[in-house]
Interface confidence: medium
């Protein structure tokens, strides 16, 4: 069976002028997934991103996340790229900044 992920992008304020954008994929199966941030359509290098483990979410499906820091005002240059079971998609940064606990 294949269950496509639900992808959600959120922003959290880190410090003045900088924000952390987090891309979360949830409720997907099987567990193999590619989740990465792109800037100007190009994947960011690994040293500028942080990934969460792919974990079971208790419903027989999985969840994970990837985060990166960006400068406020440049949100439109960033998208979260997801690839899962032959399907892929890009998800833009909304621009809404939420006050969330940072993964960094």
């Amino acid at each position: 069976r294949t269950v496509p992920p639900m992808v959600n992008v959120t922003c959290s304020e880190v410090s003045e002028g900088n924000i952390t954008v987090t891309c979360r994929a949830s409720s997907f199966y099987p567990r193999n997934i590619t989740l990465t941030w792109r800037q100007d359509g190009v994947s960011l290098s690994h040293n500028t991103q942080q990934w969460g483990d792919v974990l079971p979410d208790g419903n027989g499906t999985y969840q994970t996340w990837v985060a990166t820091r960006i400068r406020q005002g440049e949100e439109q240059r960033f998208t979260c790229y997801m690839e899962h079971s032959g399907n892929h998609g890009t998800h833009p940064v909304s621009g809404k900044v939420l006050v969330l606990q940072s993964h960094w």
């Epitope: 792109r38 100007d40 994947s43 040293n47 400068r71």
Partner: antibody, heavy 121, light 112 residues
Framework: QVQLVESGGGLVKPGGSLRLSCAAS????????MSWIRQAPGKGLEWVSY????????YYADSVKGRFTISRDNAKNSLYLQMNSLRAEDTAVYYC??????????????WGQGTLVTVSS | DIVMTQSPLSLPVTPGEPASISCRSS???????????LYWFLQKPGQSPQILIY???NLASGVPDRFSGSGSGTAFTLKISRVEAEDVGVYYC?????????FGPGTKLEIK
């Protein structure tokens, strides 16, 4: 080995048009962002335009915005620069370059040999 | 736009001697991801430019280790520990932080 070969340069009158091409080989072209950089005779380097691997992100220098159009054909491993309303100050050698500043190690790590565009009446 | 300046604009050097080129940016090139988006290129006479240093201090593949890059957010230095005849050409710094990408005016290194 990696090769970028520009073509399409030449002499054109002010107000005229030219289309530059860059043929890429030796690497997976569709994975690379590309940029055009130009160099006026005896002068320094000037970034002109950027296009992402899928063509969904495009940027231009203010000096060419509205006159130049960058595009790519991944099936043909080719990059293009359509130049309209040319001015004398557009006279330069135009270089096609790969652009990998986000991914891996480099920024502009491969450059073509350049093609000369001369705008003169 | 971010303005890049370089000094000196001309640099005569004796082979075997060290050389140093300075580059400054009008705005910090340190990104919040902790990378500094400053690059050095060399354009040898009659050739296309080639990359020397990426992200301020990383030596590009195939570049001799006599080249090194250092700096802070707005002030950068390219050093050649021992200049060789093949090092002649124009050295450019470039900011790759934001559009439009901008280059310094170039420093012409020549052999005395």
């Amino acid at each position: 080995q990696v090769q970028l070969v520009e073509s399409g340069g030449g002499l054109v009158k002010p107000g005229g048009s030219l289309r530059l091409s860059c043929a890429a080989s030796g690497f997976t072209f569709s994975n690379y962002a590309m940029s055009w950089i130009r160099q006026a005779p005896g002068k320094g380097l000037e970034w002109v335009s950027y296009i992402s691997p899928g063509g969904d992100y495009i940027y231009y220098a203010d000096s060419v915005k509205g006159r130049f159009t960058i595009s790519r054909d991944n099936a043909k491993n080719s990059l293009y620069l359509q130049m309209n309303s040319l001015r004398a100050e557009d006279t330069a050698v135009y270089y096609c370059t790969t652009d990998r500043r986000h991914y891996g190690s480099y920024a502009m790590d491969y450059w073509g040999q350049g093609t000369l565009v001369t705008v003169s009446s | 736009d971010i303005v890049m300046t370089q000094s000196p604009l001309s640099l005569p050097v004796t082979p075997g001697e060290p050389a140093s080129i300075s580059c400054r940016s009008s705005k910090s090139l340190l990104h919040s991801n902790l990378n500094t988006y400053l690059y050095w290129f060399l354009q040898k006479p009659g050739q296309s430019p080639q990359i020397l240093i990426y992200r301020m201090s990383n030596l590009a593949s195939g570049v001799p280790d006599r080249f090194s890059g250092s700096g802070s957010g707005t002030a950068f230095t390219l050093k050649i520990s021992r200049v060789e005849a093949e090092d002649v050409g124009v050295y450019y710094c470039m900011q790759h932080l934001e559009y439009p990408f901008t280059f310094g005016p170039g420093t012409k290194l020549e052999i005395k």
